[in-house]
C-alpha cells in the first residue's frame, strides 16, 4: 500500500477580519492509524490550533467527521479569524504513541492572510491655537488594518492637501499595520468654518473610504481689529464713545476701558453677533462727562482676546471744543444706562 | 501518564452477573474509545464490544448480544462492563483497552486485568 | 467474523536467533493488522499496528510486514526478555479478532 501522503490543496486563503476561515486538508490514506493535529508556524515554537484528541479548540470546527472510519478529510474552520491569526497553517498527521503520538507526515502549509479593515481615522490638531498666515500640522491616525497597502489622503474645505509625510508601521511583515500621517495647513482668517479631513481608502473598505475631521475652529484665533469712534454729543456735557471689536475668533473676550491710563470700567463679551465666516463683533461705548475734565482726555478701549497680551487703541477726546458746564464731577459718568452697552 | 485500573476480582454463581469497572487517568476519557477484551485459561483473546465514551455509542461482538453492556460515567473517567447470565465458560481475565477511534481496533494501552471465576 | 490463523503456535529459539511469526487472515484486511506481546500475569502490549508501524518505545528488533491476507512478524534477533506469548489480529473489521498466539521460549 502506497504510504500516506497529507495533501493541503490550498497555497493560501484570504479571510476578511470577523469571518471562517476553512483551511483543507486530506490523507491519501487511513494507515498509519492516529490523530491528525493542526499547527501554525513550523519548528519547535509552533503553535497547536487543533488537535482531534486532546484540548479544548472553541473556534475551530471539523468540516467533517473525523470519527467515522473512511473518513480521509482533516479541513478545519476557524471562526472570528481577527489579523492575530495570520500565518501558515499546517495539516499533520501523527501516528499513535506513547507517552505522546509522534509525528508521521506535514502538509504543505496553507498561509491564511486576513483582510482586516482600518479603524476610523483620528485626526487631531495642534495643541494650542495659532493664528492665521501661521502654518499647524494636524496628525491622521488609523490601525489594525491588513494587508499593509493603504492610500491616505488630505483635504480642506474639499481642496486635496499635498504637503503631509506619512508612514505605515511596522515596516516588516506583521498581523496588521498602523498609518500616521502629519499634515501642514496655513491658516487663512477665513477658516473658522473650515475643515481639515483625513481619507482613508483600504482593499477592505470596497471603494467607501473612511474619513476624519478636525475643525480648524478649535485651532484657530483670529485676533480682533479694533476702532474707537467719538459719536455725536448726547447732550451738551456729555460725550459717547465706541470701541468696535470687530472680526475675532473664538468669543473669550474682555475689553477694558482706561481713561488716561486709568480703568473706567471692564467687561466680557456676552451678546456678540456673528459674522458669515463665524467670526464675531462686539461693540462697547462709554458716556464721559466732558465738564468733570479741565484738560483733554485720552480714552483707551484695551481688549484681551483668548489670554493673549491685551491690544489697545486710544483716542483723544478735546475738552476745549465743549463749553464746561457748572458741577465738579471730576470723573465720567459710566452709572445707570451708562454701564449698558449698544448693539 | 495514561493508567487504566481496573476492579478487583470476582467469583461469581452461575446465572448470575458481574460488573467490571476500568477507571482512566492520563488522559481526557472522551477522547478515546473503550474496549473489553477477555481471555479464558489456554484460550486466545476475544474482543466483546466498546464504548464511545464521547457520544454514548456501543458496539458489541453478537457472541455476546443480549448478554453484555458497556457504559461508562464521563465524570469520573470510568467505563464499565456488565456480563449477565454467566455460565462456567465465562471465567476469564477480562481487561478493558483503549483505542483511537471506534473503527480502530489496536489497542495501545491495557488495564491490568480482572480475574472472573464462574463456579457453583 | 474474520479468522486469523497464526503459526506456529510454539518455537524455541537460542540468544540472537532471528524469528518469524506468521498469520494468515480469512479475508483481505488491507494492512490493518497489530501484533502484541504478552508475558504470564500480564496484560498484553501492543508492538506493531497497520502491519508495518512499530509503537513508541518498542525495540528496534520487533517488525512487521504484510498487506492483504499474509502477516510477518519478526524478531532479528531474539533476546531473554523477549521470551512471552505474540499474538497477531486484524482491526480492519468488527468484530476485532485475534490469532491463537505463539509461545516464544529459548533454547
Known amino acids: 500500500e502506497e504510504e500516506l501522503q497529507v495533501i493541503q490543496p490550498d497555497k493560501s486563503v484570504l479571510v476578511a477580519a470577523g469571518e471562517t476561515a476553512t483551511l483543507r486538508c486530506t490523507a491519501t490514506s487511513l494507515i498509519p492509524v492516529g490523530p491528525i493535529q493542526w499547527f501554525r508556524g513550523a519548528g519547535p515554537g509552533r503553535e497547536l490550533i487543533y488537535n482531534q484528541k486532546e484540548g479544548h479548540f472553541p473556534r475551530v470546527t471539523t468540516v467533517s467527521d473525523l470519527t467515522k472510519r473512511n473518513n480521509m478529510d482533516f479541513s478545519i474552520r476557524i471562526g472570528n479569524i481577527t489579523p492575530a491569526d495570520a500565518g501558515t497553517y499546517y495539516c499533520v498527521k501523527f501516528r499513535k504513541g506513547s507517552p505522546d503520538d509522534v509525528e508521521f507526515k506535514s502538509g504543505a502549509g496553507t498561509e491564511l492572510s486576513v483582510r482586516a479593515k482600518p479603524s476610523a481615522p483620528v485626526v487631531s490638531g495642534p495643541a494650542a491655537r495659532a493664528t492665521p498666515q501661521h502654518t499647524v500640522s494636524f496628525t491622521c491616525e488609523s490601525h489594525g488594518f491588513s494587508p499593509r497597502d493603504i492610500t491616505l489622503k488630505w483635504f480642506k474645505n474639499g481642496n486635496e492637501l499635498s504637503d503631509f509625510q506619512t508612514n505605515v508601521d511596522p515596516v516588516g511583515e506583521s498581523v496588521s499595520y498602523s498609518i500616521h500621517s502629519t499634515a501642514k495647513v496655513v491658516l487663512t482668517r477665513e477658516d473658522v468654518h473650515s475643515q481639515v479631513i483625513c481619507e482613508v481608502a483600504h482593499v477592505t473598505l470596497q471603494g467607501d473610504p473612511l474619513r476624519g475631521t478636525a475643525n480648524l475652529s478649535e485651532t484657530i484665533r483670529v485676533p480682533p481689529t479694533l476702532e474707537v469712534t467719538q459719536q455725536p454729543v448726547r447732550a451738551e456735557n456729555q460725550v459717547n464713545v465706541t470701541c468696535q471689536v470687530r472680526k475675532f475668533y473664538p468669543q473669550r473676550l474682555q475689553l477694558t476701558w482706561l481713561e488716561n491710563g486709568n480703568v473706567s470700567r471692564t467687561e466680557t463679551a456676552s451678546t456678540v453677533t456673528e459674522n458669515k465666516d463665524g467670526t464675531y463683533n462686539w461693540m462697547s461705548w462709554l458716556l464721559v462727562n466732558v465738564s468733570a475734565h479741565r484738560d483733554d482726555v485720552k480714552l483707551t478701549c484695551q481688549v484681551e482676546h483668548d489670554g493673549q497680551p491685551a491690544v489697545s487703541k486710544s483716542h483723544d477726546l478735546k475738552v476745549s471744543a465743549h463749553p464746561k458746564e457748572q458741577g465738579s464731577n471730576t470723573a465720567a459718568e459710566n452709572t445707570g444706562s451708562n454701564e449698558r452697552n449698544i448693539y | 501518564q495514561v493508567q487504566l485500573v481496573q476492579s478487583g476480582a470476582e467469583v461469581k454463581k452461575p446465572g448470575a452477573s458481574v460488573k467490571v469497572s476500568c477507571k482512566a487517568s492520563?488522559?481526557?476519557?472522551?477522547?478515546?474509545?473503550m474496549h473489553w477484551v477477555r481471555q479464558a485459561p489456554g484460550q486466545r483473546l476475544e474482543w466483546m464490544g466498546y464504548?464511545?465514551?464521547?457520544?454514548?455509542?456501543?458496539k458489541y461482538n453478537e457472541k455476546f448480544k443480549g448478554r453484555v453492556t458497556i457504559t461508562r460515567d464521563t465524570s469520573a473517567s470510568t467505563a464499565y462492563m456488565e456480563l449477565s447470565s454467566l455460565r462456567s465458560e465465562d471465567t476469564a481475565v477480562y481487561y478493558c483497552?483503549?483505542?483511537?477511534?471506534?473503527?480502530?481496533?489496536?489497542?495501545?494501552?491495557w488495564g491490568q486485568g480482572t480475574t472472573v471465576t464462574v463456579s457453583s | 467474523d474474520i479468522q486469523m490463523t497464526q503459526s506456529p503456535s510454539s518455537l524455541s529459539a537460542s540468544v540472537g536467533d532471528r524469528v518469524t511469526i506468521t498469520c494468515k487472515a480469512s479475508?483481505?484486511?488491507?494492512?490493518?493488522v497489530a501484533w502484541y506481546q504478552q508475558k504470564p500475569g500480564k496484560a498484553p502490549k501492543l508492538l506493531i499496528y497497520?502491519?508495518?508501524y512499530r509503537y513508541t518505545g518498542v525495540p528496534s528488533r520487533f517488525s512487521g510486514s504484510g498487506s492483504g491476507t499474509d502477516f510477518t512478524f519478526t524478531i532479528s534477533s531474539l533476546q531473554p526478555e523477549d521470551i512471552a506469548t505474540y499474538y497477531c489480529?486484524?482491526?480492519?473489521?468488527?468484530?476485532?479478532?485475534f490469532g491463537g498466539g505463539t509461545k516464544v521460549e529459548i533454547k
Open positions: 483497552a483503549r483505542s483511537y477511534y471506534d473503527y480502530d481496533g489496536s489497542f495501545d494501552y
Open positions: 492520563g488522559y481526557t476519557f472522551t477522547s478515546y474509545v
Open positions: 464504548i464511545n465514551p464521547y457520544n454514548d455509542g456501543t
Open positions: 479475508q483481505d484486511v488491507t494492512t490493518a
Open positions: 497497520s502491519a508495518s
Open positions: 489480529q486484524q482491526h480492519y473489521s468488527t468484530p476485532w479478532t
